[in-house]
Interface confidence: low
């Protein structure tokens, strides 16, 4: 209207998508009667009547707002529910009396975008490209208004830089009116960027203020030529025979070149190519001393056909040879002396130990073991252990059996066995001596003999308990070229109902047990036998 004062700026109302906007009609009583108001939406300068207030009662006009408007605050406020981006416009209320006045409200709508999704270029980027190449794409979906994107490398924001960094952003409008932003980062990368972390950040506004969301960090495959190849050996440190050793070629280029590993032939001094597994790794399993030597790696770039050679690397597989003991099978008379000597070779300094096989007791720290005034108990196994103290687990051993000449020696002289008549007894008898004795029984039954070690024998007898047997008892006799010896087993009847918890066992090597079945067993407690020879 000519001469009228300029309209004041509209009141700003900010809401998030999906929430309710409260549009308060700011007309004072002097400007109009709030019980008689018309509400309009203004879009592209076109007014559309959307709501009427008459005598404080509201009435929606047909159209896009029909279902979403209601009156609040005794008619002074119009509530617009489920706000959409399309609702971002001016709304005005117009009082009818005493004269036509209007009040304008600018509705601003906001929606936080979803978490930014970043995708790295899977094909990677060569360092020698002439212009910026696509590094990654950042997508921020369903935001309003359009969020701003900032790209970061190693935590620092990236700026447009001619021929170096280019950020190409575009947006699409979804049917909901929300925006999806896509931003492509293009850059010229250098070798040092192979570990660089890139991410994008979306900046957006909400009624509560400014906010931002960050994507995950990504690295991009960077391709650069190989300048150096080298060998790596696993495990690191001292190697020993039996280890699994992996020799692999490494290069500072990406992709790595085609590798081959060669070893210098000690006779011809020529480098001979070794056979690697499918992954280009030379696996030595188990490693042997013959694997020791000078290795080198060749890297061949199949694109340029440029070949690079590594520095040679000396590999030492430490070893201990077979252990030799002399004499190898000593036989001695009681009372005599014996010197046992142990020998072995190694790539490192060796330590020797002599142990008693049966007990594991260390008898001597050194290669020579001297035994004096030999008793029959000194017979049996002695083990020499040759070890490299600087390399745990690197050792070899050799067992030698010492035989002491003598007549049979019984494990027990006599023993009481509890039995029940008509039981089948399992009796055992053990003797040792050199030469190794044989065992016989004084009663009929099923007997079997087991050689426990070069000087020791165990005989077992299955026999039925009869009144005669109870009377006579059982004898076992061991004999060799140098004499004989006897053990006696006394059989005593036991009533099953009067058995006490410990009355079913006897001392010594045999036990006799009574069971509900008419059978009893007398079994030997066996010692673990040493192996004739074993190596570490």
């Amino acid at each position: 209207v000519p001469g009228e004062a300029e309209q004041p700026a509209p009141e700003l109302v900010e809401v998030e998508v999906g929430s309710t906007a409260l549009l308060k009609c700011g007309l004072s009583q002097s400007q109009g009667n709030l019980s008689h108001v018309d509400w309009f939406s203004v879009h592209k300068e076109k007014r559309t009547l959307i709501f009427r207030v008459r005598q404080g009662q509201g009435q929606s006009e047909p159209g896009e707002y029909e279902q979403r408007l209601s009156l609040q605050d005794r008619g002074a406020t119009l509530a617009l529910t489920q706000v959409t981006p399309q609702d971002e416009r001016i709304f005005l209320c117009q009082g009818k009396r005493p004269r036509s006045q209007e009040y304008r409200i600018q509705l601003r709508v906001y929606k936080a975008p979803e978490e930014p999704n970043i995708q790295v270029n899977p094909l990677g980027i060569p360092v020698n490209s002439k212009e910026p190449e696509e590094v990654a794409t950042c997508v921020g979906r369903n935001g309003y208004p359009i969020p701003q994107v900032i790209w970061y490398k190693n935590g620092r924001p990236l700026k447009e830089e001619k021929n170096r960094v280019h950020i190409q952003s575009s947006q699409t409008v979804e049917s909901s009116g929300l925006y999806t932003l896509q931003s492509i980062l293009k850059a010229q990368l250098v070798k040092e960027d192979k570990d660089a972390q890139f991410y994008c950040e979306l900046n957006y506004r909400l009624p509560s203020g400014n906010h931002m969301k960050e994507s995950r960090e990504v690295t991009v495959p960077v391709f650069y030529p190989t300048e150096k190849v080298w060998l790596e050996v696993e495990p690191v440190g001292m190697l020993k025979e039996g280890d699994r050793v992996e020799i692999r070629c490494l290069a500072d280029g990406n992709p790595p070149p085609h590798f081959s590993i060669s070893k210098q032939n000690p006779s011809t001094r020529e480098a001979e190519e070794e056979t690697t597994n499918d992954n280009g790794v030379l696996v030595l399993e188990p490693a042997r001393k013959e694997h020791s030597g000078r290795y080198e790696c060749q890297g061949l770039d199949l694109d340029t056909m440029i070949s690079l050679l590594s520095e040679p690397q000396e590999l030492l597989v430490n070893y201990v040879s077979d252990v030799r003991v002399s004499p190898a099978a000593p036989e001695r008379q009681e009372g005599s002396s014996l010197t046992l000597t142990c020998e072995a070779e190694s790539s490192q300094d060796l330590e020797f130990q002599w142990l008693r096989e049966e007990t594991g007791q260390v008898l001597e720290r050194g290669p020579v073991l001297q035994l004096h005034d030999l008793k029959r108990e000194a017979g049996g196994g002695y083990r020499c252990v040759a070890s490299v103290p600087s390399i745990p687990g690197l050792n070899r051993t050799q067992l030698v059996n010492v035989a002491i000449f003598g007549p049979p020696w019984m494990a027990f002289k006599e023993r009481k066995v509890w039995v029940k008549e008509n039981m089948v007894l399992n009796l055992s008898c053990e003797a040792s001596g050199h030469p190794r004795p044989t065992i016989s029984w004084n009663v009929n039954g099923t007997a079997s003999e087991q050689d426990q070690d070069p000087q020791r024998v165990l005989s077992t007898l299955n026999v039925l308990v009869t009144p005669e047997l109870l009377e006579t008892g059982v004898e076992c006799t061991a004999s060799n070229d140098l004499g004989k010896n006897t053990s006696i087993l006394f059989l005593e009847l036991v009533n099953l109902t009067t058995l006490t918890p410990d009355s079913n066992t006897t001392t010594g090597l045999s036990t006799s047990t009574a069971s509900p079945h008419t059978r009893a067993n007398s079994t030997s407690t066996e010692r673990k036998l040493p192996e004739p020879e074993s190596r570490g």
Epitope: P255, T275, N277, D278, L302
Partner: antibody, heavy 117, light 107 residues
Framework: QVQLEQSGPGLVKPSETLSLTCTVS??????????WSWIRQHPGRGLEWIGY???????YHNPSLKSRITISVDTSKNQFSLKLSSVTAADTAVYYC?????????WGQGTLVTVSS | EIVMTQSPATLSVSPGERATLSCRAS??????FAWYQQKPGQAPRLLIF???TRATGIPARFSGSGSGTEFTLTISSLQSEDFAVYYC?????????FGQGTKVEIK
């Protein structure tokens, strides 16, 4: 536990291209530890090694088939593929994908590909 | 390429008996060698690698030996589930090559 799952058509027309894909689960192709191979077996016959691909894209093909083979890898999908062009009835076989190291410990289930019009 | 030759082509054995399969390489392949078992409609199964090392889960009745050009697979006591075709393979050189197979059948 590493598993290899094969996919692709069982029927191909002569002179067309055979395409198979092998998807690896329980382990990453990109780990760089293994090669990934294709092997085939003609009906009632023995095994014929076709070629391998490494995660970096480097390949080696059986010279007898070389000019017709394309092996590719998609590390983002953890899968590798075989294309054999200009097929004839002689290419009818069960095709296997396998993980190569010291021998082939893990195999796909096999795909019978018949070349017929 | 390295040619792998298996013998015999067919081996007829009774359950519980011992089976010995041979494979010869046309040139030395050190111990870069594997044995596989294949049953109808199934993919091959790795039995032995490194010429003598049993793969995970393979019973002790399977054993491998040899180095260079001559290799042997021994099944000490054949079980019903062992009747199958057995292939040898070298992984010393490219291309990888397989033997033509030995069928172990019930006698």
């Amino acid at each position: 536990q590493v598993q290899l799952e094969q996919s692709g058509p069982g029927l191909v027309k002569p002179s067309e291209t055979l395409s198979l894909t092998c998807t690896v689960s329980g382990g990453s192709i990109s780990s760089g530890t293994y090669h990934w191979s294709w092997i085939r077996q003609h009906p009632g016959r023995g095994l014929e090694w076709i070629g391998y691909i490494y995660y970096s894209g480097s390949t080696y093909h059986n010279p007898s088939l070389k000019s017709r083979i394309t092996i590719s890898v998609d590390t983002s999908k953890n899968q590798f593929s075989l294309k054999l062009s200009s097929v004839t009835a002689a290419d009818t076989a069960v095709y296997y994908c396998a993980r190569g190291g010291d021998g082939y410990r893990y195999w796909g289930q096999g795909t019978l590909v018949t070349v017929s019009s | 390429e390295i040619v792998m030759t298996q013998s015999p082509a067919t081996l007829s054995v009774s359950p519980g008996e011992r089976a010995t399969l041979s494979c010869r390489a046309s040139q030395s392949i050190s111990n870069n060698f594997a044995w596989y078992q294949q049953k109808p409609g199934q993919a091959p199964r790795l039995l032995i690698f490194g010429a003598s090392t049993r793969a995970t889960g393979i019973p002790a009745r399977f054993s491998g030996s040899g180095s260079g050009t001559e290799f042997t697979l021994t099944i000490s006591s054949l079980q019903s589930e062992d009747f199958a075709v057995y292939y040898c393979q070298q992984y010393n050189n490219w291309p990888r090559t397989f033997g033509q197979g030995t069928k172990v059948e019930i006698k």
